[in-house]
Interface confidence: medium
Amino acid sequence: TQNKALPENVKYGIVLDAGSSHTSLYIYKWPAEKENDTGVVHQVEECRVKGPGISKFVQKVNEIGIYLTDCMERAREVIPRSQHQETPVYLGATAGMRLLRMESEELADRVLDVVERSLSNYPFDFQGARIITGQEEGAYGWITINYLLGKFSQKTRWFSIVPYETNNQETFGALDLGGASTQVTFVPQNQTIESPDNALQFRLYGKDYNVYTHSFLCYGKDQALWQKLAKDIQVASNEILRDPCFHPGYKKVVNVSDLYKTPCTKRFEMTLPFQQFEIQGIGNYQQCHQSILELFNTSYCPYSQCAFNGIFLPPLQGDFGAFSAFYFVMKFLNLTSEKVSQEKVTEMMKKFCAQPWEEIKTSYAGVKEKYLSEYCFSGTYILSLLLQGYHFTADSWEHIHFIGKIQGSDAGWTLGYMLNLTNMIPAEQPLSTPLSHSTYV
């Protein structure tokens, strides 16, 4: 007789990543009896919420409920009804909301209040919405990629589960690029972390980790662009800004009020004799690179070594996973291959930025112009940040792996956040049973 399949004993969790430019909902699934095993949680769904980041709803909070509806309804479809009430929902807001909170704590609270009420309208176990710190964002990103790469498992494998997995237990560093901030997180080699703010201690699966992390607020790709524009318009002789970071022939009108709306441009703010200015692209990688470097203050360092803006950075160590916008931008530019050297990446960026805007629009007809127009800047910014900001070199470039997904799960902070909040990463190594009831002999 045929054995009847037993009902799956699984659990689900939902995390919403409320980023500066958009919100994404992730659904995770894992076998209930293996909660403490490493590598058992995997992503079953990603739903990108239509519209901007939640911080943009500050003047229209009544629209937040409608904004979240489609993805929350999707979660209701994906997760079996019998599991709804046991499924935790977490929302973490990142740098976009950190910036809003800097401007007005009351407005940020108001947005989060409405988000909380909207999410409480669903049949899940809503656990709260909060603005996570930059340190948490870095730490959870690091936990995610190392969990998915199997780095916390004590069992060394003779086979590789992902292309860039090495069999040793050396953890990967994490490089995360968002719209409003960027994080660098790794375990330095026998190096004391000179600034306590950048030091994290974890005990995971019976092993201690001393981790360095820093989040650079305002150095996500979108805010970095606003910074660059605000810096460059200071020295423009009129309301025309000839910009090397945009393709030749590209034109766009920018409102000065929009430019100075973000706290990230405050240091460059000045009274201008015009309300609007026009960006005119000239498409020159080298000049764009030089302009970006002016955003990094490397003249001051109170430590043995710094990244930029006086922030301590230990010597880089080991392999790094670069994800989120690091991956999306480099993937678009077709530069994620392990075989592409840093010199080759630079060469290709020079060619890409020099391509006329009309040509670019024709070549990438399906891509929204707003995004398409910014790839030259974003690609150049990524190179500048990694090379001059974090001190990667042509040699160490090969240690950067541009990662979108690992084992079908997106690289990013959300999985690590959920693992932590659901207590699924034990401090000690779980006692392994000779045969679990899911093992067949």
Partner: antibody
Framework: QVQLVQSGAEVKKPGASVKVSCKAS????????MYWVRQRPGRGLEWIGR????????KYNEKFKNRATLTVDTSISTAYMELSRLRSDDTAVYYC???????????????WGQGTTVTVSS | DIQMTQSPSSLSASVGDRVTITCKAS??????IGWYQQKPGKAPKLLIH???TLQPGVPSRFSGSGSGTDFTFTISSLQPEDIATYYC?????????FGQGTKLEIK
Amino acid sequence: QVQLVQSGAEVKKPGASVKVSCKASGYTFTNYWMYWVRQRPGRGLEWIGRIAPSSGATKYNEKFKNRATLTVDTSISTAYMELSRLRSDDTAVYYCARSGIYYDYDWFFDVWGQGTTVTVSS
Amino acid sequence: DIQMTQSPSSLSASVGDRVTITCKASQDINKYIGWYQQKPGKAPKLLIHYTSTLQPGVPSRFSGSGSGTDFTFTISSLQPEDIATYYCLQYHALLFTFGQGTKLEIK
């Protein structure tokens, strides 16, 4: 106009259950949470729980978690509150009250039912 | 849970008097407080929401102020029809909580 009309007074014995209904009219039923609040004789107001009519999602005051059950029938825009294992100190007026979901200016209780008197006596 | 401490629990005043009731929240509730009037045998009636916004049709002698943790409800000139019990309600946290109530009587 917006109205919440509750079912009539009930007299119950200790240990029994009571189910109170609250029929909504004059607004979109699924756009507001329905809260249940009770007031014991000569006492203040205490909330029992709330339900989101669009999904059936509920939240209970810990004090009532194991005895109160909130349900809705969206086809007739009616909310129900059932209280089981009644005791004499459950004698009270039970109110339903709506609270907006989406906009922070609507979160308070702006419309209340007329109240249902439940008397628990042996 | 957020606790709301309302005072006084009862007060006696004359027609035309200025009457003040206070509510103190155990934590910051922004401006998410409402004030209700309840007459014997009737359901509570909303007078003010979001600290100071008067409901349509409510007389202007009723007002509210405050933010954070300390809130005040005022009747500028007491009228005979104002005799009732008044409650504050915090709706900042999803677990709403009421004050204990203030019973207002005419001297």
